[in-house]
């Protein structure tokens, strides 16, 4: 039975050209996290964090995506095209798969109120 819940950073807006941390946190389960996948709104994989093999950033995003902190992901040099939904998929044993969703809105610098770096526990 899947007892866990995914907490996310929540939906966020950030400045064009800035950076933002996307994070998910799995709680209320003792299941072992074997892999975390990060996907973009078009379902293309940004990065994978495997418990044994570590991080793999997909080539198309190598220049703008940094691993961490923790199991999170840092998106850098944001463009308007980065606006959209991002998915964290936690593969766990024995529970199975958990999924979190974060919507990122990238704004022109004159509109954006905040572009902070913060991580949830």
């Amino acid at each position: 039975m899947m007892t866990g819940t995914i907490e996310t950073t929540g939906n966020i807006s950030a400045k064009k050209g800035g950076s933002v941390i996307l994070q998910c946190h799995l709680s209320s389960t003792m299941a072992q996290v074997t892999q975390v996948n990060w996907e973009q709104h078009d379902h293309s994989l940004l990065a994978i964090r495997n418990a044994e093999l570590g991080w793999h950033i997909y080539p198309a995003f190598k220049d703008r995506v940094a691993p961490g902190p923790g199991l999170g992901l840092t998106l850098q040099s944001l463009t308007m095209n980065d606006t959209g939904e991002y998915f964290c998929t936690y593969h766990t044993y024995p529970d199975g798969t958990y999924r979190g969703r974060i919507f990122l809105e990238v704004l022109e610098s004159s509109v954006a109120e905040h572009s902070a770096r913060f991580q949830i526990p």
């Epitope: 929540g10 939906n11 807006s13 994070q23 709104h41 606006t83 959209g84 902070a116």
Partner: antibody, heavy 119, light 112 residues
Framework: EVQLQQSGPELVKPGASMKISCKAS????????MNWVKQSHGKNLEWIGL????????SYNQKFEGKATLTVDKSSSTAYMELLSLTSEDSAVYYC????????????WGQGTSVTVSS | DVVVTQTPLSLPVSFGDQVSISCRSS???????????LSWFLHKPGQSPQLIMY???NRFSGVPDRFSGSGSGTDFTLKISTIKPEDLGMYYC?????????FGGGTKLEIK
């Protein structure tokens, strides 16, 4: 003046599909997210999802995945919502509503499109 | 999904009254930047919903200052200081912090 003009009321048969349009004017269409909202029985409001005119992206309420398909036509500043395999549960008023930059809410709403599913 | 609960369901008023509508969410609406995406709408019969407040306490353009919004975390309030005829209708709160966005069930502001 910001305006969202939706297509007219529809009476459709169960099992059919239909498309609602929402033509935007008075602002730069690609600069703002477009949301879609369902109102059933004159009361409950439900967020269906949103379109991102700038890059064609979408985000859906999982409840409506497979039921609604959101698209945009940048050349005509029009957002569309196609409703698939309609049943009586889909009878409702549907609204398009522009997103407020940076606040995850809606500022301007279309006039609504009434959809009645009946044989 | 985040569950948003509004109270009361119905609020009978007299013109000139001050009223409060409550909106509670099943989890915190504060994102990792410390921002809270909670808005309020008024829906009058035969019209489209209209935005009243966004970001908890920002009045939308043209909304009179008798409307005020407050709250944090999971508990939020819309106050109307002096009820006028044009204030009657259904009030809804909306959380936009978590996917999917979710509305409260509504509060009907009506004459006693």
């Amino acid at each position: 003046e910001v305006q969202l003009q939706q297509s007219g009321p529809e009476l459709v048969k169960p099992g059919a599909s239909m498309k609602i349009s929402c033509k935007a004017s008075g602002y730069s269409f690609t600069d703002y997210i477009m949301n879609w909202v369902k109102q059933s029985h004159g009361k409950n409001l439900e967020w269906i999802g949103l379109s991102i005119p700038y890059n064609g992206g979408t985000s859906y309420n999982q409840k409506f995945e497979g039921k609604a398909t959101l698209t945009v036509d940048k050349s005509s500043s029009t957002a569309y919502m196609e409703l698939l395999s309609l049943t009586s549960e889909d009878s409702a008023v549907y609204y398009c509503a522009r997103g407020i930059k940076g606040y995850f809410a809606m500022d301007y709403w279309g006039q609504g499109t009434s959809v009645t599913v009946s044989s | 999904d985040v569950v948003v609960t509004q109270t009361p369901l119905s609020l009978p008023v007299s013109f000139g009254d001050q009223v409060s509508i409550s909106c509670r969410s099943s989890q915190s609406l504060v994102n990792s930047f410390g921002k809270t995406y909670l808005s309020w709408f008024l829906h009058k019969p035969g019209q489209s919903p209209q935005l009243i407040m966004y970001g908890v306490s920002n009045r939308f353009s043209g909304v009179p200052d008798r409307f005020s919004g407050s709250g944090s975390g999971t508990d939020f309030t819309l106050k109307i200081s002096t009820i006028k005829p044009e204030d009657l209708g259904m009030y809804y709160c909306l959380q936009g912090t978590h996917q999917p966005w979710t509305f409260g069930g509504g509060t009907k502001l009506e004459i006693k």
